[in-house]
């Protein structure tokens, strides 16, 4: 059962797993949710009736019955983890805590103009978990405007105290806002020889990498596969760190694999849930339950629905036994990983899928592409919106993409002659323009933010943001697309699609059904050759077939050039301009979104 509300002046008795410090009950609930075993918590707020050393304590708790006795206690706030809930969960915490000093290891001290600058510094520092900033009103002159970057073993403060004229907050890496480089490759036959901060058992290097990603101290990892010569180390996942944030050295070793935490990758690949099945593999751990199940898929469902289950092993039925049902062993451990992994016993193992909802909304799996054909199906491009103008009459004006729950990214040239945001309507979850009737719900536009260097599409900066009057509730038919990370500038995208309701040829009309076309990217050098009269800058990206035939056209403007990379869709381009439509040797020119990520973040995060 999902219980989201907090219980004031209430303490849960017993079931303690560990105590951490958090600046608020709300954040205590998030920490509990991400902890492998925590189901309930009790937070102690600051209060004259409480011992100050107990202020801000967050006691994480577990219970076999999923609940604990309640006791009245002033200043105690209790609640349940969101593990029991089906809604999207995020570790992202943008809150700034006034007059709180979050204690940790102060490893970097520098002057910053504002708390926001200090938070950005923390977000872009590989080791930083949280920060404390002394404001210009801070009593001690030499400490004013000092930004202290901090880290701890757990990622949460070791203590929190009241301190006037300081503010504290957390790194926004988990908000996918870091500009740190992101290394996604896994390096075979490689051991990174740096400090181990922890070790867990994992069935493969990908799971090891995902565990590293959401471990607060892990920056890179080494995994010993099941063929590793030393039996006691097989399936061992070593979580590592170093002062520089990168491995100081690497050792070549057969049957070992190494890689990096994806904490700075704007979560552009799912990092929490391990959805694969591991055949002929048994996961050992504390047994929660043994139930009969028809298949390993059914066993995984049972594990996902049992809130305390972390992983499982399914042993298929012996012929004609138990109505063809096998045994499903639901298991757990202190850290969420198997205590041992055995091979060759015939079991099929896997993990709970309840952690999948902890991934960034933009990484959520959407309907598979329909291969062939040009008409889209419902839910195929859930970030695509149709932007309508109501003046002089209502019509489709441009495409756009949902990039946040209040933000649409589109092209600046769409707003030529648009005097006011009041005449604009954004429709999401639309497949056919004919669905839009007088009573169809839409999002009003609060503000149009056009790049201040924009003059005309052909000279670049053809980018604009629409701030919506109300927030978008994410569903299967309307959800955001991931922005590319600045660390991904080197990615070569091979699966790119342009979508829109635009013309299918130069002299045509707006299409009723959302159209799609798979289009290859073209290098800027090649593109420049095709447009000798224009300057193709690095802030533009081109796509098209040399022979023409498929392209964006009038009415597609502002819509997405969506590219799939590592199973996740990225907004690589915004439809901008081109010579005619689908002409031979005239690729379409798109705004290169990765070059505007800073601008987008600056505008969307402005208070």
């Amino acid at each position: 059962e999902c219980v989201t509300q907090l219980l004031k002046d209430t303490c849960f008795e017993g079931g303690d797993i560990t105590t951490v410090f958090t600046p608020s009950a709300k954040y205590c609930q998030v920490v509990c949710t991400y902890h492998p075993r925590c189901l309930l918590f009790t937070f102690t707020a600051e209060s004259p009736s409480e011992d100050p050393t107990r202020w801000f304590t967050c006691v994480l708790k577990d219970s076999v019955t999923e609940t604990l006795p309640r006791v009245n206690r002033t200043a105690a706030i209790s609640g349940y983890s969101f593990k029991q809930c089906s809604h999207q969960i995020s570790a992202c915490n943008k809150d700034i805590y006034v007059d709180l000093d979050m204690k940790g290891i102060n490893y970097n001290s520098s002057v910053a103009k504002s708390a926001q600058e200090c938070q950005e510094r923390c977000t872009d520092d590989v080791h930083c978990h949280f920060f404390t900033y002394a404001t210009r009103q801070f009593p001690s002159l030499e400490h004013r405007n000092i930004c202290l970057l901090k880290h701890t073993q757990t990622g949460t403060p070791t203590r929190i105290t009241k301190l006037d004229k300081v503010v504290s907050g957390f790194s926004l890496k988990s908000c996918a806002l870091s500009n740190l480089a992101c290394i996604r490759d896994i390096f075979p036959n490689t051991v990174f020889a740096d400090s181990n901060i922890d070790s867990v058992m994992a069935p493969d290097a990908f799971v090891c990498g995902r565990i590293c990603t959401h471990h607060p101290g892990c920056l890179f990892f080494t995994f010993f596969s099941q063929e590793w010569p030393k039996e006691s180390q097989r399936n061992l996942c070593l979580l590592k760190t170093s002062e520089s944030g990168l491995p100081s050295t690497r050792i070549k070793k057969s049957k070992a694999l190494s890689g990096f935490s994806l904490q700075s990758c704007r979560h552009s690949i799912p990092v929490f849930c391990h959805s694969s099945f591991y055949h002929d593999t048994d996961f050992l751990g504390e047994e929660l339950d043994i139930v009969a199940a028809k298949s390993h898929e059914a066993c995984q469902k049972l594990c996902t629905n049992a809130v305390r289950c972390q992983f499982f092993t399914y042993t298929p039925a012996q012929a004609s036994c138990n109505e063809g049902k096998g045994k499903c062993y639901l298991k757990l451990s202190s850290n969420g990983s198997p205590t041992k992994i055995l091979h060759g016993r015939g079991g099929i193992s896997g993990y709970t899928l309840r952690l999948c909802k902890m991934d960034n909304e933009c990484t959520t799996k959407i309907k598979p592409r329909i291969v062939g054909g040009t008409a889209s199906v419902r839910g195929e491009w859930p970030w695509q919106v149709t932007l309508h103008t109501t003046s002089p009459t209502q019509r489709h004006l441009c495409g756009g993409s949902i990039i946040g729950n209040q933000w649409i990214l589109t092209a600046a040239h769409c707003f030529y002659g648009v005097e006011s945001p009041k005449i604009l309507r954004v429709y999401s979850g639309i497949l056919n323009q004919s669905e839009i009737k007088e009573d169809t719900s839409f999002f009003g536009v609060q503000e149009i933010i056009i790049h201040d260097q924009y003059k005309m599409a052909e000279s670049g900066y053809d980018i604009a943001l629409l701030k919506l009057e109300t927030t978008v509730n994410y569903t299967d038919s309307q959800r955001p697309i991931c922005l590319p990370s600045k660390g991904d500038r080197n990615v070569i995208y091979t699966d790119c699609w342009v979508t829109g309701w635009g013309y299918r040829k130069l002299r045509d009309k707006i299409q009723n059904t959302l159209q799609k076309a798979k289009i290859p990217l073209v290098t800027n050098e090649e593109c420049q050759k095709r447009y000798r009269g224009h300057k193709i800058t690095h802030k533009m990206i081109c796509a098209g077939y040399r022979e023409g035939g498929k392209d964006a056209c009038k009415g597609d403007s502002g819509g997405p050039l969506s590219c799939k990379h590592n199973e996740v869709w990225h907004l690589v381009g915004i439809t901008s301009w081109g010579e005619g439509c689908a002409q031979r040797e005239r690729p379409g020119v798109y705004t290169n979104v990765v070059e505007y990520v800073d601008w987008i973040l600056e505008k969307t995060q402005a208070v």
């Epitope: 996604r184 690497r250 070549k252």
Partner: antibody, heavy 125, light 107 residues
Framework: EVQLQESGPGLVKPSQTLSLTCTVS??????????WSWIRQHPGKGLEWIGS???????YYNPSLKSRVTISVDTSKNQFSLKLSSVTAADTAVYYC?????????????????WGQGTTVTVSS | DIQMTQSPSSVSASVGDRVTITCRAS??????LAWYQQKPGKAPKLLIY???SLQSGVPSRFSGSGSGTDFTLTISSLQPEDFATYYC?????????FGGGTKVEIK
């Protein structure tokens, strides 16, 4: 067939920064299967590894040169570069770029299988 | 750093001779060793990788053996084009290091 070509000034003044670029043709630098390396050879002497870079930007340097070396990669130009600061006469050498195979298929095919022809750099005032 | 010691530093041999060059690592490197051939004014050329695997296009008269700390490059029947300097290289651990080289000269 992949080919590498070093380019950069042949003469550098002491205390200045030596800058060389290696252009990769006939194949993409964008591959997890390779590191891209710089090696030098002092006149009449053996080979000295300077450092390597992966397309992702992951670098390894020779500790004896680490404080002075920066290797970078530009996947859009299919190039990688070497910068060696505060040079002295002891940095006079033939500088080679090479492809270091680190095969992602894990079949243990390793070694520097493609080399540039080398460029002579003299440090002198 | 792992030191790679090659011996001999030079060897005089005739066409048709069998030539053996040894390379010793200051610590175990499993089989992470390569052999290169370098001719004057030219870049090195990869002959052997993983201690004993022949690089494609390299004549079969070249062979490598060894594991751990002791390695050998053998040219079974020396040809005129084989007169050059040979280097071993370990890539077990960064920094990558090369042996001092063995010059194979005409007798």
């Amino acid at each position: 067939e992949v080919q590498l070509q070093e380019s950069g000034p042949g003469l550098v003044k002491p205390s200045q920064t030596l800058s060389l670029t290696c252009t990769v043709s006939g194949g993409s630098i964008y591959s997890g299967a390779y590191y891209w390396s710089w090696i030098r050879q002092h006149p009449g002497k053996g080979l000295e590894w300077i450092g390597s870079i992966h397309y992702s930007g992951l670098t390894y340097y020779n500790p004896s040169l680490k404080s002075r070396v920066t290797i970078s990669v530009d996947t859009s130009k299919n190039q990688f570069s070497l910068k060696l600061s505060s040079v002295t006469a002891a940095d006079t050498a033939v500088y080679y770029c090479a492809r270091d195979v680190d095969d992602s298929s894990g079949d243990e095919h390793y070694g520097m299988d493609v080399w540039g022809q080398g460029t002579t750099v003299t440090v002198s005032s | 750093d792992i030191q790679m010691t090659q011996s001999p530093s030079s060897v005089s041999a005739s066409v048709g001779d069998r030539v053996t060059i040894t390379c010793r690592a200051s610590q175990g490197i499993d089989s992470w060793l390569a052999w290169y051939q370098q001719k004057p004014g030219k870049a090195p050329k990869l002959l052997i990788y993983a201690a004993s695997s022949l690089q494609s296009g390299v004549p079969s008269r070249f062979s490598g053996s060894g594991s751990g700390t002791d390695f050998t490059l053998t040219i079974s029947s020396l040809q005129p084009e084989d007169f050059a300097t040979y280097y071993c290289q370990q890539y077990h651990i960064v920094p990558i290091t090369f042996g001092g080289g063995t010059k194979v000269e005409i007798k």
